[in-house]
Amino acid sequence: QRLPRMQEDSPLGGGSSGEDDPLGEEDLPSEEDSPREEDPPGEEDLPGEEDLPGEEDLPEVKPKSEEEGSLKLEDLPTVEAPGDPQEPQNNAHRDKEGDDQSHWRYGGDPPWPRVSPACAGRFQSPVDIRPQLAAFCPALRPLELLGFQLPPLPELRLRNNGHSVQLTLPPGLEMALGPGREYRALQLHLHWGAAGRPGSEHTVEGHRFPAEIHVVHLSTAFARVDEALGRPGGLAVLAAFLEEGPEENSAYEQLLSRLEEIAEEGSETQVPGLDISALLPSDFSRYFQYEGSLTTPPCAQGVIWTVFNQTVMLSAKQLHTLSDTLWGPGDSRLQLNFRATQPLNGRVIEASFPAGVDSSPRAAEPVQLNSCLAAGD
C-alpha cells in the first residue's frame, strides 16, 4: 500500500504556497537571476542572499494550509511567464581560501561558466514549463520503476554536501523512460527555499513551488557517470514538486527527521532503507519531458528531465524543517538552493498527456500546440 500523500483528482484551488507572492520575487533566487522587466520595481536592487542579514533571523512565515489535495500543473492559473533572460546569469562564487574552480555556491561571483564552461550552454536546466506550449506525445508511456522499495538494511548514506541534502541509493533501482531507455538510480537530493519563499528549480508558468525532489539516474548504456556526462540521454532525472498539504508525509519524515544529525556542512548519517517510490507522486503516467542539463556545475547537457504533473504533499512543519535545519558554506543557512530558470532556446517540452488542452473560460483563443517528436527519435 502506498503511503498517503495526496488525493489524485482534486483540482487546484487558490491556496497553493507562494501563489500570492509577486512573480518577480519567486524568480529571484540567491544566485543567477538577472533583473527582468516583469519584476516589481526596485526588486533588482535587493542585495544578494549573502549580503542580507542572517536569513535565520528573518521572521518565520508559515505557508498557507493546502485545502485541496492534489495539484495538477495544467490547472495552474494562467499567468504571464517571466521572460527568459537573453544570457543566463549563472552566478556562483569560490571560497576566498581557494582558487579551485569547483568551489561554487549559490549567489555571488564568479559566473558559473567560469566554474564550468558548459554552464553557458544553450540547453540548460531548470526551465519554466508552460503546459499550453507543451507538445502532447502519446509515445511517452508511464514510467516504470523496479526495485525502489528498499528494505531497512543495508542503511543508506544521507549527507549534507553543502548545497543540498543527498541520499545515496544502492545498486538495483531500475527505471525505464520507455522501451530501450533504461536507467539505474544513483542518488536523490532536494532543492528548497526559505521561510515564506518557494525554492523549486523548475517553475510552471512562472509559479515556483516550495521545494523539488530530484532522483538522478545513469543510463544502462554507460558504466560510469564520467562517460555519460554531456552525452544525450546519459543521465536522466525524475523531478517532482513538493507542495504544502494538511498531513505529515510519512515517507519524507524518514529523511526529514534525521536532518538535525547532518546540520553541519559535510556531515553524514546512515538511515534505514525506505520505499524510494513513496517520495514521488503516485501517477507515473502524466509528466513533462525535455532535454536539459545538470542544474549545478558542471552543468553538463544531454540530461533527460522528467517532471511529474502531480505534486507531492508535505506538511507545513516538514517544509519548514527542510528549509531551516541545514547549514551550508560560510556559516550560512543552506537555503534558496535553486538555480534560475534558463531559456528554452527553441527546445520543445513534451507532455505525456494533453496538457495544452484547456476547456476553461481562460482560453480566449485556440492554442497552437507544438508537435511531438516520438520518444527515442
Epitope: D95, E97, G98, D100, Q101, S102, H103, R157, R159, N161, G162, T168, L186, Q187, V216, L218, R224, V225, D226, L229, L235, E265, G266, P297, P298, P329
Partner: nanobody
C-alpha cells in the same frame, strides 16, 4: 567504474603513523566528495573522514585530533594522515568518491599491533 586505487596500508606499532593515499581516475574529481571508511572484521563499514569539493572536512569522533584528511585536485588524490594509531584502528580502509554516483576502492589493510 571510477577507478580508486588505495595505497599506504601496512603493519604499524601502537602510537605510530601511516599515510594512506587514494588516486582517482575521473574527470570530475573536483566535484566529488572524497572519503575514507573502514571495516574491521565482523563489523559494519564505518565513516573515518570525508572532504567535500570545497575542502570541508568531517571526521568520526574516534579519530578526531589524530587523523587528517586532505585532497590534491590537480593530482586527483585524497590522503589520510593517521597519527597516534591504536589497535582499534585495525581495519580495511576504503576510499570513496561520491558525487552523482558512488564509487569505492578495493581497500587497503591497516594493522596496528605490537
Amino acid at each position: 567504474q571510477v577507478q580508486l586505487q588505495e595505497s599506504g596500508g601496512g603493519l604499524v606499532q601502537p602510537g605510530g603513523s601511516l599515510r594512506l593515499s587514494c588516486t582517482a581516475s575521473t574527470s570530475s574529481f573536483n566535484f566529488q566528495t572524497m572519503g575514507w571508511y573502514r571495516q574491521a572484521p565482523g563489523k559494519q563499514r564505518e565513516l573515518v573522514a570525508t572532504i567535500t569539493s570545497r575542502a570541508i572536512t568531517n571526521y568520526a569522533d574516534s579519530v578526531k585530533g589524530r587523523f587528517t584528511i586532505s585532497r590534491d585536485n590537480a593530482a586527483k588524490t585524497v590522503s589520510l594522515q593517521m597519527n597516534s594509531l591504536k589497535p582499534e584502528d585495525t581495519a580495511v580502509y576504503y576510499c570513496n568518491a561520491a558525487w552523482i554516483g558512488d564509487y569505492w576502492g578495493q581497500g587497503t589493510q591497516v594493522t596496528v599491533s605490537a
